[in-house]
């Protein structure tokens, strides 16, 4: 046969020679010939390729920058990069996690729909119709009216989102 | 075009050194392949020597590895054959080669 | 060593007839990727030799297409489709999957 056009899988096409791809974790000292085999050596310290590969230099493992709230969650390998996440009460900013912001607080009238997480942040919902949040937090919930009737009380002022219910004793009834 | 030219003597005397020069043109020796000395003894046989690397390198066949060394000259895109303590069985057609390109041969007699 | 033998020593042949050269290797030439190092190459008389496959099956630019070699692991075949006039002379075998290379003994192609 005349030298190939196209090559098989692990494989590239360079000067008319179907070549050795590298294998994930090295890169490409040198092209195969037609009597010599790809040349590949392992990535250094710090450094990573994650596919089958034809680089001549390895990735940087990203720096997870400790000034901008980042800190490891899962080292990376010859074969994996680093990946980043956020100190605790702070979320990334992108799927890439480059920075870190704080978790935002749902104001009062406002409770926590979803806790934020390392890559997500806080969910707030408004409080509906019997349920009250009258602080700023990222953790609180809204929580439920009290219930007068259940303590043998009446409602003296009406409860908002913002606000629980005032409950009272019941007027006597006159002789 | 990449062409390898050989130099070198004819004639060598017993228990002497045998040097050859490979100069190529067209293809830089240090951005690939294995730069191979061969010989062709009479009678046809032919037998492989050793190479230099394009990073400098190099591997002997074990028969010879106490007597052959290759060596390089980057700036002058050459490579060179030093055999030691030669023999009249060394007595060949020696040849350098990228073995997809080969040199016009020398022939060496060994004899005093 | 991987040991090369080439058969037969001397194939004579009438122009127009197929020619089958046959190289033996005394182990696996096949390599971890898959991939087999086996060349041949062609030598007339006073001439360096040139190289016709190399990887076992691939032509060198400018072969003509009535050559084509074959084989795998230690078993390997040069065929001439049609020999012509130019064809005549000495074929060798050369693996070089291990170091050392290693060629064959050489198959001298002559008229019947």
């Known amino acids: 046969p005349e030298p190939p056009t196209a090559c098989r899988e692990k494989q590239y096409l360079i000067n008319s020679q179907c070549c050795s791809l590298c294998q994930p974790g090295q890169k490409l000292v040198s092209d195969c010939t037609e009597f010599t085999e790809t040349e590949c050596l392992p990535c250094g310290e710090s450094e990573f390729l994650d596919t089958w590969n034809r680089e001549t230099h390895c990735h940087q493992h990203k720096y997870c920058d400790p000034n901008l709230g980042l800190r490891v969650q899962q080292k990376g390998t010859s074969e994996t990069d680093t990946i980043c996440t956020c100190e605790e009460g702070w979320h990334c900013t992108s799927e890439a996690c480059e920075s870190c912001v704080l978790h935002r607080s749902c104001s009062p009238g406002f409770g926590v729909k979803q806790i934020a997480t390392g890559v997500s942040d806080t969910i707030c919902e408004p409080c509906p119709v019997g349920f009250f949040s009258n602080v700023s937090s990222a953790f609180e919930k809204c929580h439920p009216w009290t219930s007068c009737e259940t303590k043998d009380l009446v409602v003296q002022q009406a409860g908002t989102n913002k606000t629980d219910v005032v409950c009272g004793p019941q007027d006597r009834l006159r002789a | 075009d990449i062409q390898l030219q050989q130099s070198g003597p004819g004639l060598v005397k017993p228990s002497q050194s045998l040097s050859l020069t490979c100069s190529v043109t067209?293809?830089?020796?240090?951005?690939?392949?294995?730069w191979n000395w061969i010989r062709q003894f009479p009678g046809n046989k032919l037998e492989w020597m050793g190479y230099?690397?394009?990073?400098?390198?190099?591997e002997y066949t074990p028969s010879l590895k106490n007597r052959v060394s290759i060596t390089r000259d980057t700036s002058m895109n050459q490579f060179f054959l030093r055999l030691t303590s030669v023999t009249p069985e060394d007595t060949a057609t020696y040849y350098c080669a990228r073995l997809d390109y080969w040199g016009q041969g020398t022939s060496v007699t060994v004899s005093s | 060593d991987a040991v090369m033998t080439q058969n037969p020593l001397s194939l004579p042949v009438s122009l127009g007839d197929e020619a089958s050269i046959s190289c033996r290797s005394s182990q696996s030439l096949e390599n971890s990727n898959g991939n087999t190092f086996l060349n041949w190459f062609f030598q007339k008389p006073g001439q360096s030799p040139q190289l016709l496959i190399y990887?076992?099956?691939n032509r060198f630019s400018g072969v003509p297409d009535r050559f084509s070699g074959s084989g795998s692991g230690t078993d390997f075949t040069l065929k001439i489709s049609r020999v012509e006039a130019e064809d005549l002379g000495v074929y060798f075998c050369l693996q070089v999957t291990h170091v050392p290379y290693t060629f064959g003994g050489g198959t001298t192609l002559e008229i019947k």
């Open positions: 067209g293809y830089s020796i240090t951005t690939n392949y294995n």
């Open positions: 990887r076992v099956s």
């Open positions: 230099i690397r394009y990073d400098g390198t190099s």
